[in-house]
Interface confidence: medium
C-alpha cells in the first residue's frame, strides 16, 4: 500500500522536511503532490513525469519544494503556514490512480526564557515569592529546575498558571537557591539563567567562640561572636553591661584578674530589624609565663638537616616536657632530649617530622603549654607521576596530561615533547590531536629550595590504529590450590574494549574467573593444572582491533600420589626387579627409593639384578618438588619366593 | 598507495643555492611531519629536520641550522628543501620521507616511505 | 646529540648462516616501556627501508628471518639464515631525542 512518512514528523521553523514515498507502485507515468488532504488542481505543488523527468510548479509551488524521481518532497526553509496534510496522487501507466496522504507539524525555536520574581528580598517564615517565566508561548511545556535538580515535593511548593509560575510559600533560608525555568515544545528545549533566591533571615542566638572560659593573667582574650544572619550581622560587645565596641571580635591583649566579669555579644539585622544577644562569664586565674619554642632552623632539609628546638624561658629546679602530634614523645634513634629535658635534637629530619611540636612547664598546679611549632621541612621532588595512566589515543580528541610531583615547596614543572620544552605549567593541554603529537612526553619537577629535579617520560601514541596488544602477569608460576594470577592486558587505551579467549575460546563461565578493571584484568583464583592453557587479550574499537601472542600459564603442582609399575608384589627367585615410579608434578619431581626404611638411590627406577628372599621388604618411592614445596610417597610390598615353590609368580622384568 | 616523488638531478656551482621538491601522494600531506636526510657518496644517512605541513612549524640539526631551509605547499601536497652557499661538501644525495600509514607507531620519527632521493653535485 | 656506534663495520657470512649487528648509543634510547631504535636495509643506489621498529617490531612485509633486540644501549639486528639478497648496507637509527643514525654496516657473502 502507498504511504508517506514524514522525517520529521515535527519539523523546527527554517529547517527542512522530507516527505518519503513508501512503495510506490510499478510502471508509473508520473505522480503529483497536493496541499491538503484531497487532490485539488488550486492546491497542486508540484506535478513531475516520468517519460520527460520533466517537473511542473503548480499554483502551491513555493519554491522551496523540490521533487525526487522517487516521489519523495523535500520542503526546505520550513515556514509554521507548512503544517498540515499533503497528498500524493500517483498516476500509473494504465492511467489508474492511486493516492496517499502524509502530515508535519511545525513549531517555533523556542526563545532562551528569563525569570521574573515579585519579592527580590523575602523575609524568612514571613513572605511567598512567585517566579514567573517568561515569555508565554504557545504550545510549551514549563519546567523548574531548584540547584539543578527536578522540583521537590513541597506543600510550601505551589505550581500555576500553566506550571509558568513557581510560588515558594513561608520561604526559609534553605529556599536560598539556585532556581531555573526551562521551555519546551516538540523541536527545542531552552533553559534560562540561574534565578539565585536572597532570603532575609536572622539574627538567630549568636555564638560565643571559644567556648573556653577560664584564662591565666598575661593571656590574650580574643572573643569571637556569630550569628546567622542575611545579610550578615551587626555585633556590639559589652562587658559587665558597658558597651565596647562594635566588631564581631572583642581582643584584650594581656589581660588580668580585673577582665574578669560577664561578657555580651549582640547581634542585630538591620534588614529583618531583629536583635539577639547571648552572655557568657569569663574567669582570669594569676599564672606564671608561658613557654615558648625556639628552633636553630626553621627550613630544615629532608635526609640532609638536624633541628634543635629548644623550650624557653630557662627556669631553675623546674620540669620540661614534649609532645609531639599532640602525642608524647615517641621511642626513636633519631630524637634526642638534652639532660635537662628542655631541648629536643631531631637528626636527619623527614617531610613527617613536621609535627606540630609543643613544649611544657610543669608546676604545682599544672601544666604550661607553649604554642605548637610546626617545622618546614624542604624535601623532594618524587618522581613525578603523569596522569592519566592511557598511552593510546584516537586522533582528534584532546590530550590533557597533569603531573604532580610530592614536594616542599611545591615543585615547579615544566613539559617536554621528545626533549623539546613546551610550557611551564603542571598541566599540558592539546586539542584534537593528530598522529603527529605521538612522542616522548617528559614531565621535569624542579624543587627551587632544594635545587633538586626529577623527571617521567612518558609515551604517547595518537592512531586511529590500535596496537598489538601484550599480557602482563603478576604471577608466572602460581602453584595450584594455593595462588591467584592476575593477567592485564596492555596498553591502557581510551575508549576501547577489551576482551579474552582461552585456548581459542571465549571465556568460560567460572566462579574461579573474574573481569576486571574494565575487562583489562583477568584474575584466576585458586589456579588449577587445568589452567594451564593459552591465554589471548584482544583490544578493539570503532576503527580497529588487535589480538596479543598467547601467553601460556604454567602452573606449579602436585606431587601427586606416585604410581609404582608394574602392580606385581610377587618374584621368583633370579628374576630382575625394575620398579618404576611416576607422579604427575610440574615441573618433575625429585625420586628417591627406601627398602625397609633404608635410603637408596635417587633415580626414577629403581634395578635389582637377580633377586633373592633376601630382597623380600617394604619398598617406598619418596617424591618431592622443590617449586611447589610438596613432597609425596607411595610404600609397596615386594615377596620373593624361591625358584618353583610357588605357582602363578611374576618371571621378573 | 603512498609514495613520495622527488625532482632530478641537479649540477650548481660553489656559493650558489638550489631547491627540491617532494611531492606526496596516496595520503594527506597535512598529517604527517615530512623529514629530510642526507647522504654524501659512499657515507652514512645524516637526518636535515622536519617540517609539520600544517602550519610550517620546523626543527632543524644543529649541523643544518643556517643551511637548509624546509618549506611546503599543501594545496600540491608538495615539500620543499633549499640548500643555500653551496660547497664541494654538500654534494650528496638527500631523501625526504616519513611515517607511512600502515605502522602502529608510538613516536614520530621512524621512516617507512622514503623518496627515490635527489642528487645534488656542487661543482665550479 | 645521542652517538650511535655500529660493529663491525663490515661482515661477510656464508649463505645460510647467521649475521649479528650490534648499535651501542651513548645514552640510554629506552623509556616508558618502550626502545627508541631502529633498523634500515639501503641497497646501492636505493633509498633505505624499514626493517624493524622500536628495537623488536617487524616491519610489515619483511621476512621473518630479521629479527632486533636490546633496550637501554646496546642493540642487534639479527639474520637468522643470510640470503643473496640481504647484501647491503645497514643503519641503526634511534628517536629518542632528534634523530640519528649509525655508520652502517655492510654485509657481504663469503
Known amino acids: 500500500k502507498l504511504t508517506i512518512e514524514s522525517t520529521p514528523f515535527n519539523v523546527a521553523e527554517g529547517k527542512e522536511v522530507l516527505l518519503l514515498v513508501h512503495n510506490l507502485p510499478q510502471h508509473l507515468f508520473g505522480y503529483s503532490w497536493y496541499k491538503g488532504e484531497r487532490v485539488d488542481g488550486n492546491r497542486q505543488i508540484i506535478g513531475y513525469v516520468i517519460g520527460t523527468q520533466q517537473a511542473t510548479p503548480g499554483p502551491a509551488y513555493s519554491g522551496r519544494e523540490i521533487i525526487y524521481p522517487n516521489a519523495s518532497l523535500l520542503i526546505q526553509n520550513i515556514i509554521q503556514n507548512d503544517t498540515g496534510f499533503y497528498t500524493l496522487h500517483v498516476i500509473k501507466s494504465d492511467l489508474v490512480n492511486e493516492e496517499a496522504t502524509g502530515q508535519f507539524r511545525v513549531y517555533p525555536e523556542l526563545p532562551k526564557p528569563s525569570i521574573s520574581s515579585n519579592n527580590s528580598k523575602p523575609v524568612e517564615d514571613k513572605d511567598a515569592v512567585a517566579f514567573t517565566c517568561e515569555p508565554e508561548t504557545q504550545d510549551a511545556t514549563y519546567l523548574w529546575w531548584v540547584n539543578n535538580q527536578s522540583l521537590p515535593v513541597s506543600p510550601r511548593l505551589q505550581l500555576s498558571n500553566g506550571n509558568r509560575t513557581l510560588t515558594l510559600f513561608n520561604v526559609t533560608r534553605n529556599d536560598t537557591a539556585s532556581y531555573k525555568c526551562e521551555t519546551q515544545n516538540p523541536v527545542s528545549a531552552r533553559r534560562s539563567d540561574s534565578v539565585i533566591l536572597n532570603v532575609l533571615y536572622g539574627p538567630d542566638a549568636p555564638t560565643i567562640s571559644p567556648l573556653n572560659t577560664s584564662y591565666r593573667s598575661g593571656e590574650n582574650l580574643n572573643l569571637s561572636c556569630h550569628a546567622a544572619s542575611n545579610p550578615p550581622a551587626q555585633y556590639s560587645w559589652f562587658v559587665n553591661g558597658t558597651f565596647q565596641q562594635s566588631t564581631q571580635e572583642l581582643f584584650i591583649p594581656n589581660i588580668t584578674v580585673n577582665n574578669s566579669g560577664s561578657y555580651t555579644c549582640q547581634a542585630h539585622n538591620s534588614d529583618t530589624g531583629l536583635n539577639r544577644t547571648t552572655v557568657t562569664t569569663i574567669t582570669v586565674y594569676a599564672e606564671p609565663p608561658k613557654p615558648f619554642i625556639t628552633s636553630n632552623n626553621s627550613n630544615p632539609v629532608e635526609d640532609e638537616d638536624a633541628v634543635a628546638l629548644t623550650c624557653e624561658p630557662e627556669i631553675q629546679n623546674t620540669t620540661y616536657l614534649w609532645w609531639v602530634n599532640n602525642q608524647s614523645l615517641p621511642v626513636s634513634p633519631r630524637l634526642q632530649l638534652s639532660n635537662d629535658n628542655r631541648t629536643l635534637t631531631l637528626l636527619s629530619v623527614t617531610r613527617n617530622d613536621v609535627g606540630p611540636y609543643e613544649c611544657g612547664i610543669q608546676n604545682e598546679l599544672s601544666v604550661d603549654h607553649s604554642d605548637p611549632v610546626i617545622l618546614n621541612v624542604l624535601y623532594g621532588p618524587d618522581d613525578p607521576t603523569i596522569s592519566p595512566s592511557y598511552t593510546y589515543y584516537r586522533p582528534g580528541v584532546n590530550l590533557s596530561l597533569s603531573c604532580h610531583a610530592a614536594s616542599n615547596p611545591p615543585a615547579q614543572y615544566s613539559w617536554l615533547i621528545d626533549g623539546n620544552i613546551q610550557q611551564h605549567t603542571q598541566e599540558l593541554f592539546i586539542s584534537n590531536i593528530t598522529e603527529k603529537n605521538s612522542g616522548l612526553y617528559t614531565c621535569q619537577a624542579n624543587n627551587s629550595a632544594s635545587g633538586h629535579s626529577r623527571t617521567t617520560v612518558k609515551t604517547i601514541t595518537v592512531s586511529a590504529e590500535l596496537p598489538k596488544p601484550s599480557i602482563s602477569s603478576n604471577n608466572s608460576k602460581p602453584v595450584e590450590d594455593k595462588d591467584a594470577v592476575a593477567f592485564t592486558c596492555e596498553p591502557e587505551a581510551q575508549n576501547t574494549t577489551y576482551l579474552w579467549w582461552v585456548n581459542g575460546q571465549s571465556l568460560p563461565v567460572s566462579p574461579r574467573l573474574q573481569l576486571s578493571n574494565g575487562n583489562r584484568t583477568l584474575t584466576l583464583f585458586n589456579v588449577t593444572r587445568n589452567d594451564a592453557r593459552a591465554y589471548v587479550c584482544g583490544i578493539q574499537n570503532s576503527v580497529s582491533a588487535n589480538r596479543s601472542d598467547p601467553v601460556t600459564l604454567d602452573v606449579l603442582y602436585g606431587p601427586d600420589t606416585p604410581i609404582i609399575s608394574p602392580p606385581d608384589s610377587s618374584y621368583l627367585s633370579g628374576a630382575n626387579l625394575n620398579l618404576s615410579c611416576h607422579s604427575a608434578s610440574n615441573p618433575s619431581p625429585q625420586y628417591s627409593w627406601r627398602i625397609n626404611g633404608i635410603p637408596q638411590q635417587h633415580t626414577q627406577v629403581l634395578f635389582i639384578a637377580k633377586i633373592t628372599p633376601n630382597n623380600n621388604g617394604t619398598y617406598a618411592c619418596f617424591v618431592s618438588n622443590l617449586a611447589t614445596g610438596r613432597n609425596n610417597s607411595i610404600v609397596k610390598s615386594i615377596t620373593v619366593s624361591a625358584s618353583g615353590t610357588s605357582p602363578g609368580l611374576s618371571a621378573g622384568a | 598507495e603512498v609514495q613520495l616523488v622527488q625532482s632530478g638531478a641537479e649540477v650548481v656551482k660553489p656559493g650558489a643555492s638550489v631547491k627540491m621538491s617532494c611531492k606526496a601522494s596516496?595520503?594527506?600531506?597535512?598529517?604527517?611531519?615530512m623529514h629530510w636526510v642526507k647522504q654524501a657518496p659512499g657515507q652514512g644517512l645524516e637526518w636535515i629536520g622536519w617540517?609539520?605541513?600544517?602550519?610550517?612549524?620546523?626543527e632543524y640539526a644543529p649541523k643544518f641550522q643556517g643551511k637548509a631551509t624546509m618549506t611546503t605547499d599543501t594545496s600540491t601536497s608538495t615539500a620543499y628543501l633549499e640548500l643555500s652557499s653551496l660547497r664541494s661538501e654538500d654534494t650528496a644525495v638527500y631523501y625526504c620521507?616519513?611515517?607511512?600509514?600502515?605502522?602502529?607507531?608510538?613516536?614520530?620519527?621512524?621512516?617507512?616511505?622514503w623518496g627515490a632521493g635527489t642528487l645534488v653535485t656542487v661543482s665550479s | 646529540d645521542i652517538v650511535l656506534t655500529q660493529s663491525p663495520a663490515s661482515l661477510a657470512v656464508s649463505l645460510g648462516e647467521r649475521a649479528t649487528i650490534n648499535c651501542r648509543a651513548s645514552?640510554?634510547?629506552?623509556?616508558?616501556?618502550?626502545?627508541?631504535m631502529h633498523w634500515y636495509q639501503q641497497k646501492p643506489g636505493q633509498p633505505p627501508k624499514l626493517l624493524i621498529y622500536l628495537a623488536s617490531n617487524l616491519q610489515s612485509g619483511v621476512p621473518a628471518r630479521f629479527s632486533g633486540s636490546g633496550s637501554g644501549t646496546d642493540f642487534t639486528l639479527t639474520i637468522s639464515s643470510v640470503q643473496a639478497e640481504d647484501v647491503a648496507t645497514y643503519y641503526c637509527q634511534h628517536s629518542r631525542e632528534l634523530p640519528t643514525f649509525g655508520g652502517g654496516t655492510k654485509l657481504e657473502i663469503k
Open positions: 620521507n616519513t611515517r607511512g600509514l600502515s605502522t602502529m607507531i608510538t613516536t614520530r620519527w621512524f621512516f617507512d616511505v
Open positions: 645514552k640510554s634510547v629506552s623509556a616508558s616501556g618502550y626502545s627508541y
Open positions: 596516496g595520503f594527506n600531506i597535512k598529517d604527517y611531519y
Open positions: 617540517i609539520d605541513p600544517e602550519n610550517g612549524d620546523t
